[in-house]
């Protein structure tokens, strides 16, 4: 984008690449120091945090955040009502569940109150920014002499989530990974009764209800089997 701006008095000036916010024709409309990027994450569709790097500003500034939903019944501009702070400077905004509309385009605007023409607007698809809580209540069932089934619960609509199971024995250097769809269960067909197994799971809001890239935190690990292998070097690291 190489933009030529015709200024009110007829001055022409060519600018470098930058994001132009809409300005009236009678106003200065020029490149300004970019505002920090806003990053939003919706936590389990219970609340949303939109944050920015306040330390990137040339001087400590309480930037303000406004938001609305594009082309919807919720298109009224809203002020942030719950700011997050870093060293007494605004660095984010928390929105509550009633203010979150996953399937409408979320528009977030950051503004410098000392110079309100210095503003940046971003459009976000919230369904791609959901991070579920970590899976809970991991349980293991022995289906047969050599087969284990891992089950877990999520505090969200199960059909909206995919999962990643990791497991390893006390002899393994690395985790073995297995993707699991919305069914939230995993079977390990061949278990060595002489080894101690550790399992953990994380979940993602993908692909049926959204296309989120961020995984939840890992669940608390759950263990199975012998823990009598004294000479094994990995055991204590696993339990840390």
């Amino acid at each position: 984008l190489n933009t030529t701006i015709l200024t009110p008095n007829g001055n022409e000036d060519t600018t470098a690449d930058f994001f132009l916010t809409t300005m009236p024709t009678d106003s200065l409309s020029v490149s300004t120091l970019p505002l920090p990027e806003v990053q939003c994450f919706v936590f389990n569709v219970e609340y949303m945090n939109c944050t920015w790097n306040s330390s990137s500003e040339p001087q400590p500034t309480n930037l303000t955040l406004h938001y609305w939903y594009k082309n919807s019944d919720n298109d009224k501009v809203q002020k942030c009502s719950h700011y997050l702070f870093s060293e007494e400077i605004t660095s984010g905004c928390q929105l509550q569940k009633k203010e979150i509309h996953l399937y409408q385009t979320f528009v977030v605007q950051l503004q410098d109150p000392r110079e309100p023409r210095r503003q940046a607007t971003q459009m976000l698809k919230l369904q791609n920014l959901v991070i579920p809580w970590a899976p809970e209540n991991l349980t293991l069932h022995k289906l047969s002499e050599s087969q284990l089934e891992l089950n877990w619960n999520n505090r969200f609509l199960n059909h909206c989530l995919e999962h990643l199971v990791q497991y390893r024995t006390d002899w393994d250097h690395s985790w073995t990974e297995q993707s699991v769809d919305y069914r939230h269960k995993f079977s390990l067909p061949s278990v060595d009764g002489q080894k101690r197994y550790t399992f953990r799971v994380r979940s993602r809001f993908n692909p049926l209800c959204g296309s989120a890239q961020h995984w939840s935190e890992w669940s608390h690990p759950i263990h199975w089997g012998s823990n009598t292998s004294k000479e094994n070097p990995f055991l204590f690291a696993l339990e840390a």
């Epitope: 000036d13 470098a16 009678d26 106003s27 200065l28 490149s31 300004t32 000392r114 503003q119």
Partner: antibody
């Protein structure tokens, strides 16, 4: 602390050139728009020119357009005003000033006198 | 081009008394974002100008509370609730809505 130290003023004949400098310290120079403002002897303030933080935009008062050029070197933390084809009416104290964008000039240089006289 | 007009041009004031300076613009300074782009500066004798108020009513850092600004559109006012001897100098309003940026002609405040 923020400082804007000006240099380059002096006496010059009509039609000649002069370059003013404004050395900045105590802040992130490359984050601020910079302006030149002048004040003729016994008169009020007149805005001359502005340059954006990255040098991509420049605006001028009609009275200096085509004769004066505002520029900056962010690696040297210095603002310049190249004044060509000087006229008697350009005689003034020239101030540099910083602004986060284009409003409110929160710090000013000490001023440097430019006298255009034959 | 926006023309800024101040009144009065000279303002003799007794210390402790209030003072008021008017500034008018030839066009509205109200931006579509709801803010008026008007600043006030004070130039004390022999000094560079200093910022007093920005966006009409925001006091710059270190400016005493006795200074206040008001107005919208084309009519603006700078008020000093109780003038002190250190307030002497020339007061300028300035519009930064559009280029060329422009100052008022200045109001000289002096102590009676």
């Amino acid at each position: 602390q923020v400082q804007l130290v000006q240099s380059g003023g002096g006496v010059v004949q009509p039609g000649r050139s002069l370059r003013l400098s404004c050395a900045a310290s105590g802040f992130t120079f490359s984050s601020y728009a910079m302006h030149w403002v002048r004040q003729a002897p016994g008169k009020g303030l007149e805005w001359v020119a502005v340059i954006s933080y990255d040098g991509s935009n420049k605006y001028y008062a009609d009275s200096v357009k085509g004769r004066f050029t505002i520029s900056r070197d962010n690696s040297k933390n210095t603002l310049y005003l190249q004044m060509n084809s000087l006229r008697a009416e350009d005689t003034a104290v020239y101030y540099c000033a910083r602004s986060l964008y284009y409003s409110h000039f929160d710090y000013w240089g000490q001023g440097t006198l430019v006298t255009v006289s034959s | 081009e926006i023309v800024m007009t101040q009144s009065p041009l000279s303002l003799p004031v007794t210390p402790g008394e209030p003072a008021s300076i008017s500034c008018r613009s030839s066009q509205s300074l109200l931006h579509s974002n709801g803010y008026n782009y008007l600043d006030w500066y004070l130039q004390k004798p022999g000094q560079s100008p200093q910022l007093l108020m920005y966006l009409v009513s925001n006091r710059a850092s270190g400016v005493p509370e006795r200074f206040s600004g008001s107005g919208s559109g084309t009519d603006f006012t700078l008020k000093i609730s109780r003038v002190e001897a250190e307030d002497v100098g020339v007061y300028y309003c300035m519009q930064t809505l559009q280029t060329p940026l422009s100052f008022g002609q200045g109001t000289k405040l002096e102590i009676k």
